[in-house]
């Protein structure tokens, strides 16, 4: 910017150097040059000379007026045309900014990723403000009444070491900039309820050579949480529609899940888990691609007529990605397909 120049006069802005976008703005230039009675005073915005809405108020002062100023940033300076000088003489310069007061932060969420040692809180900031906006995260113990505050730009990681005095907290976010301040709604947090299990990983997959070929997907997590509920979604790479199967998992050993899939097709699998009964999910794991083997015998392929040993009421739902670039954003289309598992074996296999 131009804030460090030596001025031979003054420049000021009404209503101020930071103002609400769309406001009418007046910028004044007052010269205090020695040995110069300026013929003209000129204004420049971002280095370009302005031609319109300039008023000479008196011998030393001029004003430029902008209707509905809507640029986030501009660098203003003014000069004097002094008799006998070939070049214009610099008087002063100012950085000006326009923007918006912050929206109240919304969708505040706090989670503890297992083994991270941090509580991570995120929120939606709302519409762009265009000016420096800070977020103050308030964390107040419901047991001791002590409050901690953390400055952030878009999210915050708070060491669980600083949250040892209590398990229950009230969390809210205050958005602050030069034009205003807004508070989010308060979030009640119990530290035991917001843990997200350690990342789940699909390690490998294989398709058997049985009469009815089945694909076994192997997946694991380093979580220490005993009761974990998981979803695995899968689809052919050419398809937009995901199928989702649900599992109760015990990660003391590698999980094996069976699928009866179309032959000679490339499938993508992803898994995510949460502590059973809690609301925060892991993000979906990295896509794992597996090619099923070619069909050996001739038979009519019916992907949903797999031979279950036991039917259960746990669901397989189908979801459709809104776009191939945003696989995380899903629309639930149906949830009517049954899930089953064989009678023997102690892992959650599904057909």
């Amino acid at each position: 910017g131009i804030t460090s120049i030596n001025c031979s006069g003054d420049m000021w802005v009404e209503p101020g150097e930071i103002f609400q976008m769309g406001m009418n703005v007046s910028i004044y230039c007052q010269e205090a040059l020695k040995h110069c009675r300026p013929r003209n005073l000129y204004f420049y915005k971002n280095g370009f000379k302005e031609e319109f809405d300039i008023t000479r108020i008196n011998r030393t002062t001029a004003r430029i007026w902008y209707k509905g100023f809507s640029e986030p940033h501009a660098y203003m300076h003014c000069t004097a045309e002094c008799p006998g000088h070939f070049q214009e003489t610099l008087i002063c310069g100012k950085d000006i900014s326009s923007g918006h007061p912050p929206d109240a932060p919304s969708n505040l969420t706090c989670v503890i990723y297992e083994y991270s040692g941090n509580m991570t809180c995120t929120w939606n900031t709302g519409k762009p403000t265009y000016i420096d906006t800070k977020y103050i995260v308030h964390v107040k113990s419901l047991e001791t009444e002590e409050e901690q505050q953390y400055l952030a730009s878009s999210y915050v990681k708070i060491s669980t070491d600083s949250l040892q005095g209590s398990r229950k907290y009230l969390v809210w976010v205050q958005a602050v900039n030069s034009l205003g301040m807004e508070n989010s709604q308060q979030l009640h947090v119990h530290l035991d309820d917001i843990v997200i299990p350690s990342a789940s990983i699909i390690s490998r997959a294989e398709t058997t050579n049985d009469t009815v070929p089945k694909t076994i997907v192997y997946w694991k997590s380093k979580t220490m949480i005993e009761k974990v509920f998981c979803e695995m979604r899968y689809k052919t790479t050419t398809n937009q529609t995901w199928s989702v199967k649900e599992f109760d998992a015990n990660f003391t050993y590698v999980q094996q899940s069976e699928f009866y899939l179309e032959p000679d097709s490339k499938y993508v699998f992803q898994v995510r888990c949460q502590e059973t009964g809690k609301r925060n999910w892991q993000p979906w794991s990295s896509p794992f691609v597996h090619q099923t083997s070619q069909e050996t015998g001739k038979r009519n392929w019916q992907p949903w007529s797999s031979p279950f040993v036991h039917q259960t009421s746990q669901t397989v739902s189908q979801v459709t990605a809104k776009s191939s670039h945003e696989p995380q954003k899903m629309e639930m289309l149906s949830a009517t397909i049954f899930r089953g598992h064989p009678a023997s074996g102690n892992h959650q296999d599904i057909g």
Partner: nanobody, 116 residues
Framework: QVQLQESGGGLVQPGGSLRLSCATS????????MRWVRQAPGKGLEWVSG???????IYADSVKGRFTISKDNAKNTLYLQLNSLKTEDTAMYYC??????????GSQGTQVTVSS
């Protein structure tokens, strides 16, 4: 109970510097967020700057680039370095708990006067 004691004010010429201190006791300073506020003669309280427990800082536009807030957890002390002082910085300066807000909790403050 919480105690805050400001010091370091004085008379200084425009363009000069000062360092204000705020000695604290009665709470866990290393976990505390702190702020400075000021009150110019005949005016209301004005928030100046804040710092959280990890050292992240925030400043009022009027002092940005000239003032620096910091804290020393070993000494339980909050600081405000004032550089390039202007006559409009003349005020009583107070420290308080919390990053942001134009209130203080009744400490006695320290006077800063900028005059040529």
């Amino acid at each position: 109970q919480v105690q805050l004691q400001e010091s370091g004010g004085g008379l200084v010429q425009p363009g000069g510097s000062l360092r204000l201190s705020c000695a604290t006791s009665g709470f866990t300073f290393r976990l505390a967020a702190m702020r400075w506020v000021r009150q110019a003669p005949g005016k209301g309280l004005e928030w100046v700057s804040g710092i959280d427990s990890r050292g992240s800082t925030i400043y009022a536009d009027s002092v940005k680039g000239r003032f620096t807030i910091s804290k020393d957890n070993a000494k339980n002390t909050l600081y405000l370095q004032l550089n390039s002082l202007k006559t409009e910085d003349t005020a009583m300066y107070y420290c308080a708990q919390g990053v942001y807000g134009d209130t203080y909790s009744g400490s006695q403050g320290t006077q800063v006067t900028v005059s040529s």
